[in-house]
Interface confidence: medium
Amino acid sequence: GITIPRNPGCPNSEDKNFPRTVMVNLNIHNRNTNTNPKRSSDYYNRSTSPWNLHRNEDPERYPSVIWEAKCRHLGCINADGNVDYHMNSVPIQQEILVLRREPPHCPNSFRLEKILVSVGCTCVTPIVHHVA
Amino acid sequence: GITIPRNPGCPNSEDKNFPRTVMVNLNIHNRNTNTNPKRSSDYYNRSTSPWNLHRNEDPERYPSVIWEAKCRHLGCINADGNVDYHMNSVPIQQEILVLRREPPHCPNSFRLEKILVSVGCTCVTPIVHHVA
């Protein structure tokens, strides 16, 4: 692969755990203005596999608020508006990075953490296990 | 709200930009072992709004690899396996936090960045009603 030379203007680190411990500027560069998933689209209501959004709050985590999707039905909504159990509503999950205060309650010291969140739901054909 | 007292064992910060610049331990605490979305489930293929996963790589970002979903069709797959344009496949998007090397090419200095990623697709009733 291509080796990119280290920028000579990089800050030095005297931390004994370097490079595991790094400096992070929390002044977020944000290309997206809308952070409330309920406002960003109404897909959660219009989907054939609709979902509800649950607020998950944890002051020891950054971001402290994460929205979790929970599928409303086991089946999917058909053209009549009824739940069809020949299809399944399933959550689409994604691993995301969060910052966890470590040690706890410290304002300036964090550890990266990966968590699995459900972002929304999709309608899938079920895997049918045929009984022999 | 409840004020949580600061832990007396917190590291000190002499950074003039504190609390904007913090120390982060990159030794990730990960509850999830499977990071390849193609292995985690086959929903992307079984969905009525199937999607393809595209690898987005950026060495100046952490994580350097992010998988982006692109819906395969404008419409949704009906029970016969045909694409029906009376419904729409749409991407489910989520804002996630990533670390951007700042200054560029620095191994130990980052800035938090929010980016919008498409995680998967769901099938929705169109806002424009094709039939009045």
């Epitope: - | 069709h73 029970a79 016969d80 344009y85 009376h86 094709h130």
Partner: antibody, heavy 116, light 107 residues
Framework: EVQLLESGGGLVQPGGSLRLSCAAS????????MGWVRQAPGKGLEWVSS????????GYADSVKGRFTISRDNSKNTLYLQMNSLRAEDTAVYYC?????????WGQGTTVTVSS | DIQMTQSPSSLSASVGDRVTVTCRAS??????LNWYQQKPGKAPQLLIY???NLQGGVPSRFSGSGSGTDFTLTISSLQPEDFATYYC?????????FGQGTKVDLK
């Protein structure tokens, strides 16, 4: 083989009525929107009406609204077009078609002639 | 109602020619645009759906492009069996209007 077969066309006097049928085979009829398209002699195609899989939602061209009624019987795999108060300008070949947004399967057409 | 205007109304071409038919919608229809081919005495056949998707079984010499209000059907190398009338249709909103047709005949 996926097939649509129209019937019920014929000669009718102005003001009269006619009911067209379209028998579907080779696919799961109840999964699909269905529609009617007509073509007057020497003219282009004109969309007439469409109906959703359950039959719960229908749409009509302005030229036939209030006079034509689309319906379906999923148990019989059949699509219908009830045409009342027929006019000379309704003279055309009427096609039934499977409707996926684009009409991907068509019948051979049935001719309706409105004349005194 | 959305008006669909095709041009030209007719064109003469030779086998092997590249043929282009355009369709303009009176308002934006995103990519909800279909193209059909019809031969005399026959039912129409779907060629392209969703502006650019080739219907199964249709030769790859047919292609579609465009979005919003302006769309194009292209036949890269005209074959003898392609002499026919071509129609565009919007499926964005009811009524699902067709263009007036473009007749492609032998020069």
């Amino acid at each position: 083989e996926v097939q649509l077969l129209e019937s019920g066309g014929g000669l009718v006097q102005p003001g009269g009525s006619l009911r067209l049928s379209c028998a579907a085979s080779g696919f799961t009829f109840s999964f699909y929107w269905m529609g009617w398209v007509r073509q007057a002699p020497g003219k282009g195609l004109e969309w007439v009406s469409s109906i959703r899989p359950s039959g719960g939602m229908t749409g009509y061209a302005d030229s036939v609204k209030g006079r034509f009624t689309i319906s379906r019987d999923n148990s019989k795999n059949t699509l219908y077009l009830q045409m009342n108060s027929l006019r000379a300008e309704d003279t055309a070949v009427y096609y039934c078609a499977r409707d996926l947004g684009g009409m991907d399967v068509w019948g051979q057409g049935t001719t309706v002639t409105v004349s005194s | 109602d959305i008006q669909m205007t095709q041009s030209p109304s007719s064109l003469s071409a030779s086998v092997g020619d590249r043929v282009t038919v355009t369709c303009r919608a009176s308002q934006s229809i995103s990519i909800y645009l279909n193209w059909y081919q019809q031969k005399p005495g026959k039912a129409p056949q779907l060629l392209i759906y969703g502006a650019s998707n080739l219907q199964g079984g249709v030769p790859s010499r047919f292609s579609g492009s465009g979005s919003g209000t302006d769309f194009t059907l292209t036949i890269s190398s005209l074959q003898p069996e392609d002499f026919a009338t071509y129609y565009c249709q919007q499926s964005y909103i009811t009524p699902r209007t067709f263009g007036q047709g473009t007749k492609v005949d032998l020069k």
